[in-house]
């Protein structure tokens, strides 16, 4: 029977910058029942406080509701590990919330085929961003992915849509369902989880030469352009 | 609606002991620091103790270290405080109250007089 | 300790004045100050906190201001309900303190 080895916060995420979870992971309990708790401090104060909430992040975890996370302070926090034998400190993490932000996935996703008379037929997507986030306020910049891949295929292909809330893409295989998914991530933080995939049968009919694709919009100042392969690898690593 | 009511409270002797019972409704008890707060007949208010949500971090003021003892039950939803050693300065109505640790302290008892008198 | 020094300890006024308390800290306490109103028999209600911001509820005529060592509580047209004892509160450091209180009586 020994103390509890050295706890580790090692994950801290938020939603929206406006309540914040974090997550340890034990240590070695020692071999005796073992009491975790979160302290924490907001850069420049004196005052250390324990965690509001044990319960909404599930085990091993601390959440921060609105009332406690300030965007602009530094927290500093530690988790203590205690048994009957004696207690253990993880090493203090600091956390700034404009760092630490993983919004939910984006939502709506819709995938049509468009087949205009005058023009090439493409995959014209469109989603919403996730509920949680205020993009009014001007505090967020949210940035956007897409992937797409015939149903039996084993690798995706990925485009970056920007800001957008759309895209179209014309390279396609006919004939073939392809799923379709997006992501979105903040300027300053982590990519979103993968929304739930949308199946999209594309016609038999639907004729494009594979080596050209659309790009955003957006990205070409509003105007639908053809661009090759190689000009499409130029344009996202400039 | 939050409520918090203290019971507890009476006449004992110099030395006696008293435990001071604080029972909470209307707040999720667990997510909430409390402390006890004092007031002598006539005088201003006086901190006493503060308890953390996981009682890990305990504090007194150093005219009752020693001789006070807070506690908390976060299933029963009550904050407690164990009062030994008593003396006529400890003569008080002891309220508790909910520390919003982004605030200050925003829900307060209505108090329970404690006479400390031979 | 950190002494909190409030003043006046008494203050005569009537409905419809502006009425000013002031608390000094006795060493920097940032914004960490709360203001409370407390009427005879009952417990005390939370005004302000951090030093400026408006506890919800809590009427607008009431404002706080002040950081470091002195704040200010400001009741700007004083009504009949208003009369009452009022403290502040540091909440930067261990013992927490609590001002002598001012007591706001009718002229």
């Known amino acids: 029977q020994l103390p509890p080895g050295k706890p580790e916060i090692f994950k801290c995420r938020s939603p929206n910058k406006e309540t914040f979870t974090c997550w340890w992971r034990p240590g070695t309990d020692g071999g005796l029942p073992t009491n975790y708790s979160l302290t924490y401090h907001r850069e420049g104060e004196t005052l250390m406080h324990e965690c509001p909430d044990y319960i909404t992040g599930g085990p091993n975890s601390c959440h921060f509701g609105k009332q406690y996370t300030s965007m602009w302070r530094t927290y500093i926090m530690m988790v203590n590990a205690t048994n009957q034998m004696g207690s253990s400190f993880s090493d203090e993490l600091y956390v700034d919330v404009t760092y630490i932000v993983q919004p939910d996935p984006p939502l709506e996703l819709a995938v049509e085929v468009k087949q205009p008379e005058d023009r090439k037929p493409y995959l014209w997507i469109k989603w919403s961003p996730p509920t949680l986030i205020d993009l009014k306020t001007g505090w967020f910049t949210l940035l956007y992915e897409i992937r797409l891949k015939p149903e039996k295929a084993a690798e995706w292909e990925i485009h970056f849509a920007g800001q957008q809330t759309e895209f179209k893409i014309l390279s396609l295989h006919p004939g073939q369902k392809y799923l379709v998914q997006v992501r979105c991530k903040p300027d300053h933080g982590y990519w979103s989880a993968w929304s739930p995939a949308t199946f999209i049968q594309i016609p038999s009919d639907f004729t494009m030469n594979d080596e050209q694709k659309l790009i955003s919009e957006e990205d070409l100042g509003g105007e639908q352009k053809l661009i090759s392969e190689e000009d499409l690898h130029h344009h996202h690593h400039h | 609606e939050v409520q918090l009511v203290e019971s507890g409270g009476g006449l004992v002797k110099p030395g006696g002991s008293l435990r001071l019972s604080c029972a909470a409704s209307?707040?999720?008890?667990?997510?909430?620091?409390m402390n006890w707060v004092r007031q002598a007949p006539g005088k201003g208010l006086e901190w006493v103790s503060s308890i953390s949500t996981r009682s890990s971090l305990i504090h007194y003021a150093d005219s009752v270290k020693g001789r006070f003892t807070i506690s908390r039950d976060n299933a029963k939803n009550s904050l407690y405080l164990q009062m030994n050693s008593l003396r006529d300065e400890d003569t008080a109505v002891y309220y508790c109250?909910?520390?919003?640790?982004?605030?200050?302290?925003?829900?307060w008892g209505q108090g329970t007089l404690v006479i400390v008198s031979s | 300790d950190i002494q909190l020094t409030q003043s006046p300890s008494f203050l005569s006024a009537s409905v419809g004045d502006r009425v000013t308390i002031t608390c000094w800290a006795s060493q920097g306490i940032s914004s960490y100050l709360a203001w409370y109103q407390q009427k005879p028999g009952k417990a005390p209600k939370l005004l302000i906190y951090v030093a400026s911001t408006l506890q919800s509820g809590v009427p607008s005529r009431f404002s706080g201001s002040g950081s470091g060592t002195e704040f200010t509580l400001t009741i700007s047209s004083l009504q009949p309900e208003d009369f009452a004892t009022y403290f502040c509160q540091q909440l930067n450091s261990y013992p927490l303190t609590f001002g002598g209180g001012t007591k706001v009586e009718i002229k």
């Open positions: 209307g707040i999720t008890f667990s997510s909430y620091s």
């Open positions: 109250a909910r520390w919003d640790a982004a605030a200050a302290f925003d829900y």
